[in-house]
């Protein structure tokens, strides 16, 4: 039930120490001050697709 610290988060989400939880990066453009948004900036968005095979 309770994720360990810095748990691996699914694509499009990032770990929040503040909330002890993986959080959705989609909220970051509107609310950029969330601590998990720092992790979102380092990873490609969930809808990212490779442009080559």
């Amino acid at each position: 039930e309770q994720a360990p610290g810095n748990a691996p988060c699914s694509s499009g989400s990032s770990w929040s120490a503040d909330l002890d939880k993986c959080m959705d990066c989609a909220s970051c453009p509107a609310r950029p001050h969330s601590d998990f948004c720092l992790g979102c900036a380092a990873a490609p968005p969930a809808h990212f697709r490779m442009l080559w095979p």
């Epitope: 039930e1 309770q2 610290g5 120490a17 503040d18 909330l19 002890d20 939880k21 959080m23 959705d24 909220s27 970051c28 509107a30 609310r31 950029p32 001050h33 969330s34 601590d35 948004c37 720092l38």
Partner: antibody, heavy 123, light 111 residues
């Protein structure tokens, strides 16, 4: 306008189960990022965080009390519940619920608190 | 658990002067870009009221005479100039990791 209000039994005996209800308005616990915590304060003493429930029904507990605590919610009725089993006189306190949700910037402060409900454990 | 130690436990400050309250954490509650420390004011018979979030961000509606600073393990709440309505107990709280804990409180009296 956000508001929260706690309710409980007032007085109960040692070894019984304490059941508390937090009824709130002005926000939805189905909103992504939203959560509600329970905090208690013995008379004249400091604050102790007990448990937190998230919009997606994820839960967190204070490890020192985890075996005795159960937090739950009824999103449609705007209520959060806390049960504490096997209460003792040390559980005598004012119990608060507080909202923790995203503000305009994306901070997650414990920004709104209920007035608290007083609980006395006595034989 | 991260233990938060507030000092002093109580203080008396003359009207218009500066009140300084310290909160020391048993381990860092900051990262390179974030500090997870918050301050509350509580008056008798009332719930705590959020004053400052994330070290230095004033909550909406809180007067500008309140300010917060610090990083790592050492944090400060300043009130200047102190007004009569500031008589209360002040608590620090962190959200760096579980469990979220509070300091023991500092009672401010206005002289």
């Amino acid at each position: 306008q956000v508001s929260l209000k706690e309710s409980g039994p007032g007085i109960l005996q040692p070894s019984q189960t304490l059941s508390l209800t937090c009824s709130f308005s002005g926000f939805s616990l189905s909103t992504s990022g939203m959560g509600v915590s329970w905090i208690r304060q013995p008379s004249g003493k400091g604050l102790e965080w007990l448990a937190h429930i998230y919009w997606d029904d994820d839960k967190r507990y204070n490890p020192s009390l985890k075996s005795r605590l159960t937090i739950s919610k009824d999103t449609s009725r705007n209520q959060v519940f806390l049960k504490i089993t096997s209460v003792d006189t040390a559980d005598t306190a004012t119990y608060y619920c507080a909202r923790r949700g995203p503000d305009y910037y994306g901070y997650y402060p414990m920004d709104y608190w209920g007035q608290g409900t007083s609980v006395t454990v006595s034989s | 658990d991260i233990v938060l130690t507030q000092s002093p436990a109580s203080l008396a400050v003359s009207l218009g002067q500066r009140a300084t309250i310290s909160c020391r954490a048993s381990k860092s509650v900051s990262t390179s870009s974030y500090s997870y420390m918050h301050w509350y004011q509580q008056k008798p018979g009332q719930p705590p009221k959020l004053l400052i979030k994330y070290t230095s961000n004033l909550e909406s509606g809180v007067p500008a005479r309140f300010s917060g600073s610090g990083s790592g393990t050492d944090f400060i709440l300043n009130i200047h100039p102190v007004e009569e309505e500031d008589a209360a107990t002040y608590y620090c709280q962190h959200s760096r990791e579980l469990p979220w804990t509070f300091g023991g409180g500092t009672k401010l009296e206005i002289k």
